[in-house]
C-alpha cells in the first residue's frame, strides 16, 4: 500500500495473507468460513510450493493470539483467467478446515448487486504489499482510502486505454495506491466487499495509471457455484 498508514490491529477481521512457502505472497479476503477469495495470478508462479492462508493477523512476524495458518484443500482459479490478461483475475481457496471465527477472524459480506460503485465513493484497500517504490515490505497490515474512478476516465488512452471491462473497476492512484503484494486483497466500500486487487504488473502511485479491481458482483454466480 503506497501513501497509506498502519491499520488498526484486527479491525479488518476478513483480511487474509496468502502465503507461499511461509512468506507473504498476496492478499485475500475471507468470504465464508472455509473460503478465501484472492487473485488468480497470485498462484501462477506457485508451481510445487506450499500455499497456505494466514488469518487473524496484523503483524506477519510477531506472535498474536488470533493468528492461525491454514493449509489449502483446494485452489479454484476462475476458469477464464489467463496469464496475459487482467480479466477474470479471481481465485477461491478452500481452507483445510473451517476457520475459527472470533473478533479477529470474520467473513466479509460481498456485493451481489451488479451495479457500479458511484465515482468518488471512498473505499478502503488493505494489504501487506510494498509501501514505497524501493520495494520495502511492511510487517504490519497497511490500509488506504481511495476514491472510485469512473470507468470512462480509466479507459482513456493515457490511463488503461480501453482495457477496463464492465467486470472491472478503478480507483484513483495519485500517490495513494495498492501495489505489489496487495494483489488479491479487498476493496471495501461501505463495509461491503466490492473489488479484489488485480495482480497485473502495474506502475503504482501514478495518477494516470489507476488501480484496477475485479468487481465481485460481476462474478456472483461463479462464487456461489464454487462455494456451494
Amino acid at each position: 500500500i503506497l501513501g497509506g498508514r498502519e491499520a488498526e490491529a484486527h479491525a479488518r477481521p476478513y483480511m487474509a495473507s496468502v502465503q507461499l512457502n511461509g512468506a507473504h505472497l498476496c492478499g485475500g479476503v475471507l468470504v465464508a468460513e472455509q473460503w478465501v477469495l484472492s487473485a488468480a495470478h497470485c498462484l501462477e508462479d506457485a508451481a510445487d510450493g506450499k500455499v497456505q492462508v494466514l488469518l487473524g493477523a496484523h503483524s506477519l512476524s510477531q506472535p498474536e493470539p488470533s493468528k492461525r495458518l491454514y493449509d489449502v484443500l483446494r485452489a479454484v482459479p476462475h476458469p477464464d483467467s489467463q496469464p496475459d490478461t487482467i480479466d477474470h483475475d479471481l481465485l477461491l481457496l478452500q481452507l483445510s478446515e473451517k476457520a475459527t471465527l472470533g473478533p479477529a477472524v470474520r467473513p466479509l459480506p460481498w456485493q451481489r448487486v451488479d451495479r457500479d460503485v458511484a465515482p468518488g465513493t471512498l473505499c478502503d484497500v488493505a494489504g501487506w504489499g510494498i509501501v514505497n517504490h524501493a520495494g520495502r515490505r511492511p510487517d504490519s497490515l497497511q490500509h488506504v482510502l481511495l476514491p472510485v474512478l469512473d470507468r470512462a476516465t480509466c479507459n482513456r488512452r493515457t490511463h488503461h486505454d480501453g482495457a477496463i471491462t464492465e467486470r472491472l473497476m478503478c480507483a484513483e492512484s495519485n500517490r495513494r495506491d495498492s501495489c505489489k503484494g496487495d494483489s488479491g486483497g479487498p476493496l471495501v466500500c461501505g463495509g461491503v466487499l466490492e473489488g479484489v486487487v488485480t495482480s497485473g504488473s502495474r506502475v503504482c502511485g501514478n495518477r494516470k495509471k489507476p488501480g484496477i479491481y475485479t468487481r465481485v458482483a460481476s462474478y456472483a454466480a461463479w462464487i456461489d457455484s464454487v462455494l456451494a
Partner: antibody, heavy 116, light 112 residues
C-alpha cells in the same frame, strides 16, 4: 460489434446552427469517452474535443470552444455536437470516435456543408 | 499546441516497395506517465480512419505485420515493408499525450 452512427449533417446557411448525433451500440456507452473529429474536403483530420459520458466533463480544442457544444443522452447511448454561428470553413465531414483503445472505433461520418 | 509535421506530403511507390513515412513533433510527446502516445492511422477516400499503430510501435489487432512503427522523443516513423495494393491510402500520425491532441497533415501514398 461496436458501432457508431452519425446523423444530422446537411446544408446550412452561414450563421446557422446544426446538431449532429452519434448513436453508439455494441458496448456500454458510459465506459468510454466520446471524441469528435472533423475533416474539411481534401484536408487533414482536426480534433474538436471530447466528452466523458459519466460526468459530462468536456474538453474542447480552443478553436471550437465558443461555437461548439457537446452533450449526451445516456438513455439513448447518443452523443451530440451542437454547432452554432457556422461559417463556410466549417464545411467538413464530422466524425465521432470512441476513445479506448486509442481511436479504434469511428463512425462513418456526416457531411456538413455551410453555404448560401 | 503540439504540431506534427509529416514527410513527405505525398509519395509514389510500386507494389512490393518499402515505404517510410516520418512524423516530427514540435516538442516531446512523452506523457507524464512515461508512455508516448504516438499513433498512426490509415484513411481511404470516403472512409473513416483506421488505427494501425498505437504507443509508437504496437500494432493494433488485425493489422498486418508489414506495418511497423518506431521512434522516440520527437521523431517517429511508419514503415510498410512491402507495399500491397490495398495500402494505397493517406496516412496520419497523431499524438494523444498532450491536450489538444493533434494529427499530422497526412501523407498520401499513390501508385507509381
Amino acid at each position: 460489434e461496436v458501432q457508431l452512427v452519425e446523423s444530422g449533417g446537411g446544408l446550412v446557411q452561414p450563421g446557422g446552427s446544426l446538431r449532429l448525433s452519434c448513436a453508439a451500440s455494441g458496448y456500454t456507452f458510459t465506459s468510454y469517452y466520446m471524441n469528435w473529429v472533423r475533416q474539411a474536403p481534401g484536408k487533414g483530420l482536426e480534433w474538436i474535443g471530447d466528452i466523458n459520458p459519466v460526468t459530462g466533463d468536456t474538453d474542447y480544442n480552443a478553436d471550437f470552444k465558443r461555437r461548439f457544444t457537446f452533450s449526451l443522452d445516456t438513455s439513448k447511448s447518443t452523443a451530440y455536437l451542437q454547432m452554432n454561428s457556422l461559417r463556410a470553413e466549417d464545411t467538413a465531414v464530422y466524425y465521432c470516435t470512441r476513445e479506448g483503445p486509442s481511436f479504434a472505433y469511428w463512425g462513418q461520418g456526416t457531411l456538413v456543408t455551410v453555404s448560401s | 499546441d503540439i504540431q506534427l509535421t509529416q514527410s513527405p506530403s505525398s509519395l509514389s511507390a510500386s507494389v512490393g516497395d518499402r515505404v517510410t513515412i516520418t512524423c516530427r513533433s514540435s516538442q516531446t510527446i512523452v506523457h507524464s506517465n512515461g508512455d508516448t502516445y504516438l499513433e498512426w492511422y490509415q484513411q481511404k477516400p470516403g472512409k473513416a480512419p483506421n488505427l494501425l499503430i498505437y504507443k509508437v510501435s504496437n500494432r493494433f489487432s488485425g493489422v498486418p505485420s508489414r506495418f511497423s512503427g518506431s521512434g522516440s522523443g520527437t521523431d517517429f516513423t511508419l514503415t510498410i515493408s512491402s507495399l500491397q495494393p490495398e495500402d494505397f491510402a493517406t496516412y496520419y500520425c497523431f499524438q494523444g499525450s498532450h491536450v489538444p491532441v493533434t494529427f499530422g497533415q497526412g501523407t498520401k501514398v499513390e501508385i507509381k
